[in-house]
């Protein structure tokens, strides 16, 4: 695969990945439960990280935002802010890698550049996409442990308040949106490691200029074992004559032909 | 913690009327449904009416066309107004709410009852 594709796929892919991370953080299904035991209507019940809803059989549907900060439950936090976390980085490694992409021309931009960030976005990326796994992991780890309340406790008060409190034995199953949280940020992981994939790609290979061959021409030799030349008394007349088979060649042969010596 | 306060009962006359009333108050979400029970002496506990978020309501028997409930989803109270009293709705009055209490988790709250006596 080309870099400019392994690029560009990955940029899509965490494109497509960041924008289910978004989706599972504003959607309200993040736990569902069915509460038919009870006599005056089937409640669906539902809970996101912002809200909790009620559905009726009626159809009737009741949500409620979580206004109060202190009441919640630490979990309950911490998920939101891995999932604000990762949404931040992943805005953040989209708008670097825009300017990374190999396709894309900006001013007088090298290679070198563009492959610094495609690996900053491509960190980017997979640090987003391990924070909306991790994320929805605790929030389906914290559904887990509840999945059974089989304590009664007993409340009592002055002047009427208080009262019995009984758990209701049901379980809590896991919502859509634990499921497109799992997969966006598996895409978005998967295409912060593809940027950096492609980064080693737009990387310049120094060793290209550490090994430099030189090549001598015929007419700069400056060393010809076995030759000898027109000083030696022969003149012009052994101009173009061979002395002996294998021997040395005339200067016209040499030109054409160079030895194996002829490279310093 | 779910509290409930419960008020509104009392001695009424055959015929007469009572208006119940039960808040919930404490940390919760949602508060599907409300609603009332009975208990008289020697009896079993039994559903007088009950109300969805929506307004959906459910009666029982013996008080259909005489009892109304309806509530208040901001204040998170039920109200049980209770017309044409007879001697046999003499019982112990028990408001019960089903609470949406956190993530993952939700209760069925009792409150400690009102007594209501229909008698001459």
């Known amino acids: 695969m080309s870099v400019t594709a392994c690029q560009g796929l990955g940029f899509v892919v965490s494109l497509i990945g960041f924008a289910g991370i978004i989706a599972a953080t504003c959607m309200d299904q993040w736990s569902t439960q069915d509460l038919y035991n009870n006599p005056v209507t089937a409640v669906f019940n539902y809970q996101g990280l912002w809200r909790s809803c009620v559905r009726e059989s009626s159809g009737f549907t009741e949500c409620r935002g979580y206004f109060t900060l202190l009441g919640l439950p630490a979990m309950l936090q911490a998920v939101r802010a891995l999932m604000i976390v990762g949404i931040v980085l992943g805005v953040i490694g989209i708008l670097v890698s825009i300017f990374a992409l190999k396709c894309i021309r900006i001013g007088s931009m090298d290679d070198s550049a563009k492959a610094k960030m495609t690996l900053t976005s491509g960190i980017l990326f997979i640090i987003s996409g391990i924070c909306a796994i991790i994320g929805v992991s605790v929030f389906a780890n914290m559904l887990v442990t509840n999945f059974w309340m089989s304590t009664a406790n007993m409340y009592s008060g002055m002047g009427g308040m208080g009262g019995m409190v009984q758990t209701v034995q049901t379980r809590y199953t896991f919502g859509a949106a634990l499921f497109v949280g799992w997969v966006a940020g598996g895409l978005t992981l998967i295409g912060g490691v593809m940027m950096c994939i492609a980064c080693r790609g737009l990387t310049p290979d120094d060793s290209n200029f550490k090994a430099v061959s030189y090549h001598a021409s015929g007419q700069n030799v400056a060393y010809r074992p076995g030759g000898f030349k027109a000083s030696t008394g022969f003149g012009s007349n052994t101009r173009n004559k061979k002395i002996y088979d294998g021997g040395a060649r005339t200067e016209d042969d040499e030109q054409s032909h160079p030895t194996k010596y002829d490279y310093v | 913690q779910v509290q409930l306060q419960e008020s509104g009962g009392g001695l009424v006359q055959p015929g007469g009327s009572l208006r119940l009333s039960c808040a919930a108050s404490?940390?919760?979400?949602?508060?599907?449904?409300m609603g009332w029970y009975r208990q008289a002496p020697g009896k079993q506990r039994e559903l007088v009416a009950g109300?969805?978020?929506?307004?959906?309501?459910n009666y029982g028997d013996s008080v259909k066309g005489r009892f109304t409930i309806s509530r208040d989803n901001a204040k998170n109270t039920v109200y049980l107004q209770m017309n044409s009293l007879k001697p046999e709705d003499t019982a112990v009055y028990y408001c019960?709410?089903?609470?949406?209490?956190?993530?993952?988790?939700?209760?069925?709250?009792w409150g400690q009852g009102t007594l209501v006596t229909v008698s001459e």
């Open positions: 109300i969805s978020t929506g307004g959906t309501t």
């Open positions: 404490g940390t919760f979400f949602n508060i599907p449904v």
């Open positions: 019960n709410v089903l609470v949406i209490s956190g993530i993952g988790s939700h209760l069925e709250v």
